[in-house]
């Protein structure tokens, strides 16, 4: 058993709020069985670590947020993985039961003689985790005894089903936001005919079945679905490609619901074949506007649109964060350990001092070199704030006129706090109203990020648009320069005057062949030629028939 | 069908342009490669248009050769031609809009280099 | 980058044998092949593409096979108008390659 995984940050407070985020990286294979994790993370992990400690900060000096009431937290590490977080929030679990049994006076000593030790506050209500399948796990754990899970980032659409998942709340909006946000862009543009991927597991599955329901709804038409791991590889990649290329000239268009390493796998594999710049890339947020994705591959990867959770950088956040330093950082027991991943350094005479360094840490080391904010920051803030929110109203609705946590609020029921965290209304951390649907989710705000040459072997992700709560917005000019160079994903041009749509057996309705009607007839509908009846003969327009005019033979006239 | 045109004796250092005329292909949805065969040797790649217009060469070429297309023609421009040159040069039809296989042929143009 | 390398250069068969031409690509090509027959003064023709799909119009006597970097070229029950050069091509990148064409194998009916 690997003892990072015990490591836990405290802050002690009235009410205890429970976070795991993904301090290391999930084990590799053939360390899954054991449980150990990988390297420590940055934004994923030590970010949203001090972001917990200092939100809280921030809100316990808040007068006007649960005033006479301190908020602690108990931080654990889920390291990207089911069986890890599980297993930490178990132990969570296990403080609630302890202190459950503490109040009715339950606990003993081994010996039978009653026990003087106070045991940890429980956990009121959990944080995170980042990862919807990790999320989905560790709901079904908590959920059984009444805890409140607010994640940051899981974004899967089965998490709305309040049936199954009814204690798991988001300040971030379900998959099928984005699905329906991709499925605007393509009918924005007249893209009638495009090719699918996915990535294999829950994010890029559910995703890919709303988008393909979605496009259905609307007449677009999907020429093929495929779908490929995260980390499979090169070959797979590679057939995938030519797949995509069997359909081209007509599906230009490739929407991929996919994680970033899987579009970096396309990318990749365009380099090998030979295929940059014949497809355009429509991502999800798995792409976002990451630069891990394109790096090296940028000529690939122009022109892609991808859909980007809506979330500025929080500056309070970066003041607070950057001043950091292992000397006086002593809350965040993880901090050395990153210190000396980030610096490549040892830091001598520390408890935590890595002998794999050679370098010894120098004191002018800062943070604000290379600094990057974690893109989920706004969201891991409201997430800690909707929880603070939400006891902040249950205060004033058990405990009216009282300052404080009043008897009836203690010990505090999950049911009651659930209740009142789905009624939250605040203005997050960036301006913009937090609250949440009867499923437990939040409304859907992205951005539309462009790929682009900004100048010779200069590429840089530009925002071109926006999609609010249904309502897409798009420059057009930004990303086309001009009309004519949209790009066509389409399977059969429009039918001429006096033609009709005959669509091959087996295949889509959007790929058909145009046959004219015959000399007697007119178009009936897109699909249908009828003949006009006898003494009657095809409009112009051929739209309809029209009455031939009675013309009476006389003996004097010429042969016609 | 696919025919090659424009192949004559030439020096060294003169250019020279190949034409490849197409009739019953629509030049937007299939690809179409060059491929050269000098005197007794085997089939040799120069390079493909795709259907949306891009251009792929043989690591070889290094810039001697550009392919460009009409909407009914395919052109392959020789850059400052050498004895090695010499060979009968090849339009064909690719399977689909970008490399694969090249499933219709034209009949082939020669090009002798010589001086 | 994916260099096709074709044995043998030259084959010998007697009407009615069999003949087996091998191909190898520098790395896998994913099935990703052609075979054409080539006769003198004409242009070459199509026989099997993806390893193994016969071209239409191409006897069934010639049979394509392999995966990954083998791949075998198999013509049973040979006929004199059999005679002619056999190129295998791989169909799957145009990117930094050399010769996409094997190096041709030569048959002769007897």
């Known amino acids: 058993q690997s003892s990072e995984r015990r490591v836990v940050a405290h802050m002690p407070g009235d009410i205890i709020i429970g976070a795991l985020f993904s301090v290391h990286h999930q084990p590799t294979v053939d360390k899954v069985h054991e449980r150990k994790c990988g390297a420590v993370r940055e934004q994923y992990g030590i970010q949203r670590v001090e972001a917990m400690l200092h939100t809280l900060e921030r809100i316990n000096s808040d007068p006007t947020l649960l005033p006479n009431i301190t908020l602690g937290c108990e931080i654990r590490d889920s390291c990207w993985h089911s069986a890890v977080a599980l297993e930490q929030s178990i132990e969570f679990i296990r403080d609630s039961l302890i202190s459950s049994e503490e109040e009715e006076g339950l606990v003993r000593c081994v010996d039978g003689s009653s026990s003087s030790f106070r045991s940890k506050k429980p956990i009121v209500g959990v944080i995170g985790p980042g990862s919807s399948s990790v999320a989905i796990q560790v709901q079904n754990l908590l959920q059984l005894f009444n805890i409140p899970q607010i994640a940051y980032s899981a974004t899967s659409m089965d998490l709305s089903d309040k049936t199954l998942f009814k204690y798991f709340m988001r300040v971030v909006p379900s998959d099928a936001q984005q699905a329906r946000a991709m499925v605007d862009i393509v009918k924005r543009y007249n893209w009638t005919y495009v090719s699918a991927v996915h990535t294999e597991g829950n994010y890029g599955e559910s995703g890919m079945e709303a988008f393909k329901d979605m496009s259905a709804k609307e007449g677009i038409c999907i020429a093929h679905s495929y779908k490929i791991y995260s980390n499979a590889g090169e070959q797979s990649f590679d057939k995938l490609l030519k797949k995509l290329t069997s359909h081209l000239p007509k599906a230009r268009v490739v929407a991929c619901f996919c994680e970033g390493m899987t579009v970096r796998g396309l990318l990749m594999a365009m380099r090998r074949l030979g295929l940059a710049g014949e497809f355009l890339l429509l991502g999800s947020d798995g792409w976002a506007d990451r630069y891990d994705v394109t790096d090296g591959y940028q000529r690939e990867a122009v022109g892609g649109i991808t859909i980007k959770l809506q979330s500025p950088d929080v500056k309070w956040f970066d003041d607070y964060y950057l001043k950091l330093r292992p000397e006086t950082n002593h809350r965040n027991p993880w901090f050395q350990e990153f210190w000396q991943h980030r610096f490549q350094c040892r830091l001598e005479g520390f408890p935590q001092e890595n002998s794999k360094y050679n370098k010894t840490c120098n004191s002018s080391l800062t943070l604000k070199t290379h600094h990057v904010q974690d893109s989920k920051m706004g969201f891991v803030i409201n997430a800690i704030y909707s929880m603070a929110y939400g006891l902040h109203n249950m205060q004033m609705s058990l405990c009216p006129g009282y300052a404080g946590l009043c008897d009836a609020m203690k010990p505090i029921d999950g049911r009651k706090l659930l209740e009142s965290l789905m009624k939250t209304n605040f203005t997050g951390v960036s301006g913009d109203t937090i609250l949440f649907d009867e499923n437990g989710d939040s409304p859907g705000r992205y951005e539309i990020m462009n790929f682009k040459e900004m100048g010779k072997d200069y590429f840089d992700y530009i925002n071109v648009g926006s999609w609010d709560n249904g309502e897409l917005k798009m420059d057009d000019d930004e990303v086309w320069s001009k009309k004519s160079n949209i790009i066509r994903s389409v399977c059969s041009e429009p039918c001429e005057k006096g033609q009709i749509k005959v669509i091959r057996k087996g295949e889509v309705s959007c790929c058909w062949t145009c046959t004219p009607c015959k000399e007697n007839e007119y178009v009936f509908d897109e699909y249908t030629c009828k003949a006009c009846q006898l003494g009657s003969w095809p409009t112009d327009d051929l739209t309809g028939c029209d009455l031939i005019p009675v013309q009476y033979l006389r003996w004097g006239d010429p042969e016609p | 069908s696919l025919e090659e045109s424009g192949g004559r004796l030439v020096t060294p250092g003169t250019p020279l342009t190949l034409t490849c005329t197409v009739s019953?292909?629509?030049?937007?949805?299939?690809?179409v490669g060059w491929v050269r065969q000098a005197p007794g040797k085997g089939l040799e790649y120069i390079g493909i248009?795709?259907?949306?217009?891009n251009t792929w060469y043989a690591s070889w070429v290094k810039g001697r050769f550009t392919i460009s297309k009409t909407s009914t023609t395919v052109d392959l421009k020789l850059a400052s031609l050498t004895t090695e040159d010499t060979a009968t040069y090849f339009c064909?039809?690719?399977?689909?809009?970008?490399?694969?296989?090249?499933?219709?042929w034209g009949p082939g143009t020669l090009v002798t280099v010589s001086s | 980058a994916y260099d096709m390398t074709q044995t043998p250069a030259s084959v010998e068969v007697a009407v009615g044998g069999t003949v087996t031409i091998k191909c190898q690509a520098s790395q896998s090509i994913s099935s990703y092949l052609a075979w054409y027959q080539q006769k003198p003064g004409q242009p070459p023709k199509l026989l099997i593409y993806d390893a193994s799909d016969l071209a239409s119009g191409v006897p069934s006597r010639f049979k394509g096979s392999g995966s990954g970097t083998e791949y075998t070229l198999t013509i049973s029950g040979v006929q004199c108008d059999d005679a002619a050069t056999y190129y295998c091509?791989?169909?799957?990148?145009?990117?930094?390659?050399?010769?996409?064409f094997g190096g041709g194998t030569e048959v002769v009916v007897k």
């Open positions: 064909a039809r690719g399977h689909g809009a970008t490399y694969d296989y090249f499933n219709l």
């Open positions: 019953g292909i629509d030049l937007s949805s299939y690809a």
């Open positions: 091509q791989q169909g799957l990148a145009t990117a930094n390659v050399d010769n996409v």
């Open positions: 248009i795709y259907a949306s217009g």
